[in-house]
């Protein structure tokens, strides 16, 4: 069977006026997954995102991440889109200093 991913969105200061937002998916099986940032509902160009490899996390499941840099104050226009084993979900950027948003999808 399949194990749905835990999705976690974090933000960190990148440079003046910019932040890096990272979307991590973990503890999922099988390894096929779509993880991408969307701006105003449209997937960002590939050249503006950085992806981590899909790696085993030691429990027979997998983990990966995608990150992009955005302007501070425009967080509400960005969402992380996850698709796995026919299920999908969108995850907002946490506001302010809230660093972790965990969502488990069934």
């Amino acid at each position: 069977g399949s194990v749905p991913p835990m999705v976690n969105v974090t933000r960190s200061e990148a440079s003046e006026g910019n932040i890096t937002v990272t979307c991590r998916a973990s503890s999922f099986y099988p390894r096929n997954i779509t993880l991408t940032w969307r701006q105003d509902g449209v997937s960002l160009s590939h050249d503006t995102q950085q992806w981590g490899d899909v790696l085993p996390d030691g429990n027979g499941t997998y983990q990966t991440w995608v990150a992009t840099r955005i302007c501070q104050g425009e967080e509400q226009r960005f969402t992380c889109y996850m698709e796995h084993s026919g299920n999908h979900s969108t995850h907002p950027v946490p506001s302010g200093n809230s660093h972790h948003h965990h969502h488990h999808h069934h």
């Epitope: 701006q39 105003d40 509902g41 449209v42 997937s43 960002l44 160009s45 503006t48 302007c71 226009r77 698709e83 026919g86 999908h88 969108t90």
Partner: antibody
Framework: DVQLVESGGGLVQPGGSRKLSCAAS????????IHWVRQAPEKGLEWVAY????????YYADTVKGRFTISRDNPKNTLFLQMTSLRSEDTAMYYC??????????????WGQGTTLTVSS | QIVLTQSPAIMSASLGERVTMTCTAT???????LHWYQQKPGSSPKLWIY???NLASGVPARFSGSGSGTSYSLTIGSMEAEDAATYYC?????????FGTGTKVEIK
């Protein structure tokens, strides 16, 4: 009032070039993504190209990729579509359309009146 | 690219009749990224149903939308004269974005 006014259409020979413009007013142009959508005579809508508010993300329909270039000049509130290697099948009414963001939903909420491009010898 | 095929291409309906049209995608589309637009001759398209099943502002309650994956539909519960128009589905799940082929609804 939100207004989008296209211009630049006309008669062009096959293989020729043309640049369409879309002048925006009544809203903060620099905060909205904009699309070009076309409609051939008596045909359906065909999405052509998209440019995000900050020009960071640009996409094209497969039918125009490599021939058309979308761009914008935010200080001048203007959107452009540079078209090259034009074909008869590019004959259509070209609309610019604003991509709204409202309550987490994105959609076309305002359209121009269109400009007609005819590609013929 | 995701191709959206609408059927029927043209349909005639009597006033009061129930009307259903479909939009079939060549690969799965999230319902969040599937909208329907209505267009009347000489006018720009208007958002009609968003995210597969939500009526846009001002759209009569006789309209409804449903579906998931590769199959979506728009239904008019009881056809009225003002509903005569062409309806297009539109997806932005994957780029390039695409519109459906359109369904023209006429009054019989």
């Amino acid at each position: 009032d939100v207004q989008l006014v296209e211009s630049g259409g006309g008669l062009v020979q096959p293989g020729g070039s043309r640049k369409l413009s879309c002048a925006a007013s009544g809203f903060t142009f620099s905060t909205f993504g904009i699309h070009w959508v076309r409609q051939a005579p008596e045909k359906g809508l065909e999405w052509v190209a998209y440019i995000s508010y900050d020009s960071r993300t640009i996409y094209y329909a497969d039918t125009v990729k490599g021939r058309f270039t979308i761009s914008r000049d935010n200080p001048k509130n203007t959107l452009f579509l540079q078209m090259t290697s034009l074909r008869s099948e590019d004959t259509a009414m070209y609309y610019c359309a604003r991509w709204a963001y409202e309550g987490g939903v994105n959609y076309f909420d305002n359209w121009g009146q269109g400009t007609t491009l005819t590609v013929s010898s | 690219q995701i191709v959206l095929t609408q059927s029927p291409a043209i349909m005639s309906a009597s006033l009061g009749e129930r009307v259903t049209m479909t939009c079939t995608a060549t690969s799965g589309v999230s319902s969040s990224y599937l909208h329907w637009y209505q267009q009347k001759p000489g006018s720009s398209p208007k958002l009609w149903i968003y995210s597969s099943s939500n009526l846009a502002s001002g759209v009569p309650a006789r309209f409804s939308g449903s579906g998931s994956g590769t199959s979506y539909s728009l239904t008019i519960g009881s056809m009225e004269a003002e509903d005569a128009a062409t309806y297009y589905c539109h997806q932005f799940h994957r780029s390039p974005l695409t519109f459906g082929t359109g369904t023209k609804v006429e009054i019989k």
